[in-house]
Interface confidence: low
């Protein structure tokens, strides 16, 4: 089933992200949404990311025989983020432009930040209903990629162990205990 409607929004949330994080820092970003400064505070490697495109998508879910009773609304994170220097004196002499052009093997991309798991009911042709679990994106963020990262990760940001799919226990109905949920 095709999307019935897609509405493009632009994220105006300012998210400071280190431009040269260590690999560990990159992984940790997935846990806190990238909202942190480098250890040295605001230095010349700190960038503010704006312009992350959040596409609101409305679609029906099908498993081939059954179709969702109501359409599903979710966010689709798209596009590259526009990098802007944090400190005002970076803007004047074209330094920022040169800085970024020298790093053509790097790019900032808009990727999934937060997800929520929910249950949806599908109506079947024979009158019965089925319930499925799905994960929908609820927020986007900017993430720095290198060309090597792109090739090795198959373009799946959340393939990194820092941002796995939620523990199965968390995907169960709310009436069940959540003692096994991941920290």
């Amino acid at each position: 089933f095709k999307n019935d409607a897609t509405e493009i929004l632009y994220s105006h949330v300012v998210k400071p992200v280190p431009a040269h994080p260590s690999s560990n820092s990159t992984l940790n970003q997935a846990r806190n949404g990238g909202r942190h400064f480098s250890n040295t505070g605001l230095d010349r490697n700190t960038r503010v990311q704006v312009g992350c495109r959040e596409l609101r998508s409305t679609k029906y879910i099908s498993d081939g025989q059954c179709t969702s009773i109501s359409p599903l609304k979710e966010l689709v994170c798209a596009g590259e983020c526009l990098p802007l220097p944090v400190l005002p004196n970076w803007i004047g002499g074209g330094y920022g432009t040169k800085y970024w052009s020298r790093r053509s093997s790097q790019e900032w991309r808009c990727v999934n930040d937060k997800t929520r798991t929910q249950r949806i009911q599908l109506q079947c042709q024979d009158g019965s209903t089925r319930t499925y679990k799905i994960t929908v994106v609820t927020a986007c963020k900017c993430k720095r990629y290198t060309r090597q990262h792109n090739e090795s990760s198959h373009n799946f940001e959340s393939m990194s162990p820092a941002k796995p799919v939620q523990h199965h226990r968390e995907r169960k109905r709310a009436s069940k205990s959540s003692k096994h949920s991941m920290s």
Partner: antibody, heavy 118, light 107 residues
Framework: QVQLVQSGAEVKKPGSSVKVSCKAS????????ISWVRQAPGQGLEWMGW????????RYNRKFTGRVTITADESTSTAYMELSSLRSEDTAVYYC???????????WGQGTLVTVSS | DIQLTQSPSSLSASVGDRVTITCQAS??????LSWYQQKPGKAPKVLIY???NLETGVPSRFSGSGSGTDFTFTISSLQPEDIATYYC?????????FGQGTKLEIK
């Protein structure tokens, strides 16, 4: 009707890798968990891991950590399972399966026989 | 990992018989137990999920019950087409695990 169609049988040498594909049709691929389950000849079923196609998020059985990689290509509605450092005991039929809401498997691929032999 | 112990490992019964297979978990699995039927050379097929729910299209002679750690799968009246191996599977904790299987034969 949902269908999961897997790639053909493979014969591999010990130490090599194998990549099995699973093409889904008839459903919304991005909103599904695809698991991989294997079955050695005459043996039971063993869950290897899953991928959530919408985000690429994965979880693996600890037994296979470091050797198995599950990926997905939304554009072709295809999931992949790659197993490296193959040994003779990896000889098995490998199934992809689509999860229902609470972790049972509603649809299965036809299976791919991987034979590891020198 | 949660261990599932199925019994018996094999059984022989006559057409029309009531057949019972048990599955014991090494810890409470909160009723997240499903049952599969597998015929030779074929992929497994889910019959029962969440302990007692019959999957769409599965004959009503198949049923499941239990709670906590002890679960039972029943075929109320065995049919020739029921000859297969049956597996239980827990989905309460990762990794998902299966019982070792029960091979069902006709006398």
């Amino acid at each position: 009707q949902v269908q999961l169609v897997q790639s053909g049988a493979e014969v591999k040498k010990p130490g090599s890798s194998v990549k099995v594909s699973c093409k889904a049709s008839g459903g919304t691929f991005s909103s599904t968990y695809i698991s991989w389950v294997r079955q050695a000849p005459g043996q039971g079923l063993e869950w290897m891991g899953w991928i959530y196609a919408g985000t690429g998020g994965t979880r693996y059985n600890r037994k296979f950590t470091g050797r198995v990689t599950i990926t997905a290509d939304e554009s072709t509605s295809t999931a992949y399972m790659e197993l490296s450092s193959l040994r003779s005991e990896d000889t098995a039929v490998y199934y992809c399966a689509r999860e229902g809401v609470d972790g049972w498997f509603t649809y299965w691929g036809q299976g791919t026989l991987v034979t590891v032999s020198s | 990992d949660i261990q599932l112990t199925q019994s018996p490992s094999s059984l022989s019964a006559s057409v029309g018989d009531r057949v019972t297979i048990t599955c014991q978990a090494s810890q409470d699995i909160n009723n997240y137990l499903s049952w599969y039927q597998q015929k030779p050379g074929k992929a497994p097929k889910v019959l029962i999920y969440d302990t007692s729910n019959l999957e769409t299209g599965v004959p009503s002679r198949f049923s499941g019950s239990g709670s906590g750690t002890d679960f039972t799968f029943t075929i109320s009246s065995l049919q020739p087409e029921d000859i297969a191996t049956y597996y239980c599977q827990q989905s309460d904790n990762l990794p998902y695990t299966f019982g070792q299987g029960t091979k069902l034969e006709i006398k």
